[in-house]
């Protein structure tokens, strides 16, 4: 077999962060003060960093409060994302449907018929793998039909959101794998719903999204 | 095996609220998510809303946000859900279920044996 | 929100038929090509147990009797052959999008 996958590299999550995070994201400081009476007009033109007033208040922007938003606010609460995706672009060679320039135009119908039967294939060959969303078609090519396409995969954001990805990642290679090398065309006839090339599997890459608490942090300020 | 315990059956009337547990074992609650399902006396399926174990994170059902908690105590495994301000339309059954898997959107596998809830004055 | 609507409410089959129930979400309950659709068995005093997940994947324990098919809006569930056990209530349920939804029930009834 001349399946090939290639070796992941991710940077991994900070364990520890001197940003104040809980998940409900609640504001630590009031945001807004309100202003009564005949001084209201003048606080009006003074609101300091961005803020606006609304006729009774400064609104402040983020990281700002206090009466005319001339505070900073000493800590940004920030939560992580609640799911982690991976993507995982694959490449396999269907040897049961002949390739036509049809096969090119995505707006096609035989485009949209390929499509729906690959991702059922797909569904089926990924179907016990809970981290599994979905396959989308990148790219149709000639060789008969050599299919580039996504595989996503998402799990719940925990610390060891990359452990389960990556486990996730190497049942998908073995899966495919699996598929690829028992549904073939036997005398030039696919008794399966699709039929591939034994040694047409390749996994070019992987990408795992990456959470990184500073950089949110960064963004925010 | 994984198995998930509900508290018994409760009493309450009209503006009360109600704490539900359900306790789990044979996995660990904080690899997945604990949905919260109800079922009125002879009608279908409601899901009232979901939590992450490991961080807190919660979604509810937009008819019960607002009168719906659900927490989690991972130190015991086990997922609360209390329902406030109740009216005789919430006397129902309510179950807690697991999710399939670690990523969501996904199924519910592993169901608790259900709490009955009557709201009675 | 996504409503599922079941079809028919109630059927009666006899043994060794076969039952058919549908499932028709009012958008499209699909993400990179893979339905987010699942059917549960609930009989009398017990809750709901898993069939099929994710359209068409078969549950570890349930019998092969029951299938999964559908895509999109448009799902079905059946049943062949029908047993006597399989008397109990079915509920489509999509996780595609918050909030879940489920249909309204199918109560099935062996002749």
């Known amino acids: 077999r001349t399946t090939s996958f290639p070796t992941v590299t991710t940077t991994a999550v900070p364990t520890n962060t001197t940003i104040k995070s809980n998940p409900t994201s609640t504001p630590t400081v009031p945001r807004t003060t309100t202003c009564f009476g005949d001084g209201c007009q003048n606080t009006a033109s003074r609101c300091k960093n961005g803020g606006t007033w609304d006729g009774l208040k400064c609104q402040c922007p983020n990281l700002y409060y206090g009466e005319l938003c001339e505070e900073v606010v000493s800590s940004i609460d920030i939560g992580p994302p609640e799911t982690i995706s991976a993507q995982m672009e694959l490449t396999v060679t269907v040897t049961s449907v002949k390739f036509t320039e049809e096969l090119k135009n995505h707006s096609s119908q035989e485009f949209q018929e390929f499509k729906q039967t690959f991702t059922e294939q797909m569904n089926i060959v990924y179907s016990g793998i809970p981290e599994y969303v979905g396959v989308n078609i990148t790219k149709l090519r000639l060789g008969s039909v050599v299919v580039e396409h996504d595989v996503l995969l998402r799990t719940k954001y925990t610390p060891e959101y990359k452990t389960v990805l990556d486990n996730a990642t190497e049942v998908v290679k073995e899966k495919i794998t699996k598929v690829t090398t028992q549904q073939i065309m036997i005398n030039d006839i696919c008794s399966d719903m699709m039929c591939f090339n034994t040694t047409g599997t390749q996994v070019q890459n992987i990408t795992v999204t990456q959470y990184d608490p500073e950089e949110d942090c960064r963004k925010m300020a | 095996q994984v198995q998930l315990v509900q508290s018994g059956a409760e009493v309450k009337k009209p503006g009360a609220s109600v704490k539900v547990s359900c306790k789990a074992s044979g996995f660990n609650i904080k690899d997945t998510y604990i949905h919260w399902v109800r079922q009125a006396p002879g009608q279908g399926l409601e899901w009232m809303g979901r939590i992450d174990p490991a961080n807190g994170y919660t979604k509810y059902g937009p008819r019960f946000q607002g009168r719906v908690t659900i927490t989690a105590d991972t130190s015991t495994s086990t997922v609360y859900m209390e329902l406030s301000s109740l009216r005789s339309e919430d006397t129902a059954v309510y179950y807690c279920?697991?999710?399939?898997?670690?990523?969501?959107?996904?199924?519910?596998?592993?169901w608790g044996q259900g709490t009955l809830v009557t709201v009675s004055s | 929100d996504i409503v599922l609507t079941q079809s028919p409410a109630s059927l009666a089959v006899s043994p060794g038929q076969r039952a058919t129930i549908t499932c028709r979400a009012s958008?499209?309950?699909?993400?990179?090509?893979?339905?987010?659709m699942h059917w549960y068995q609930q009989k009398p005093g017990q809750p709901p147990k898993l069939l099929i997940y994710r359209a068409s994947s078969l549950e570890s324990g349930v019998p092969a009797r029951f299938s999964g098919s559908g895509s999109g809006t448009d799902f079905t569930l059946t049943i062949n052959p029908v047993e006597a056990d399989d008397t109990a209530n079915y509920y489509c349920?999509?996780?595609?999008?918050?909030?879940?939804?489920f249909g309204q029930g199918t109560k099935v009834e062996i002749k």
């Open positions: 349920q999509q996780s595609n999008e918050d909030p879940y939804t």
């Open positions: 958008e499209s309950v699909e993400t990179y090509g893979n339905s987010f």
């Open positions: 279920a697991r999710n399939y898997g670690t990523s969501y959107p996904n199924a519910m596998d592993y």
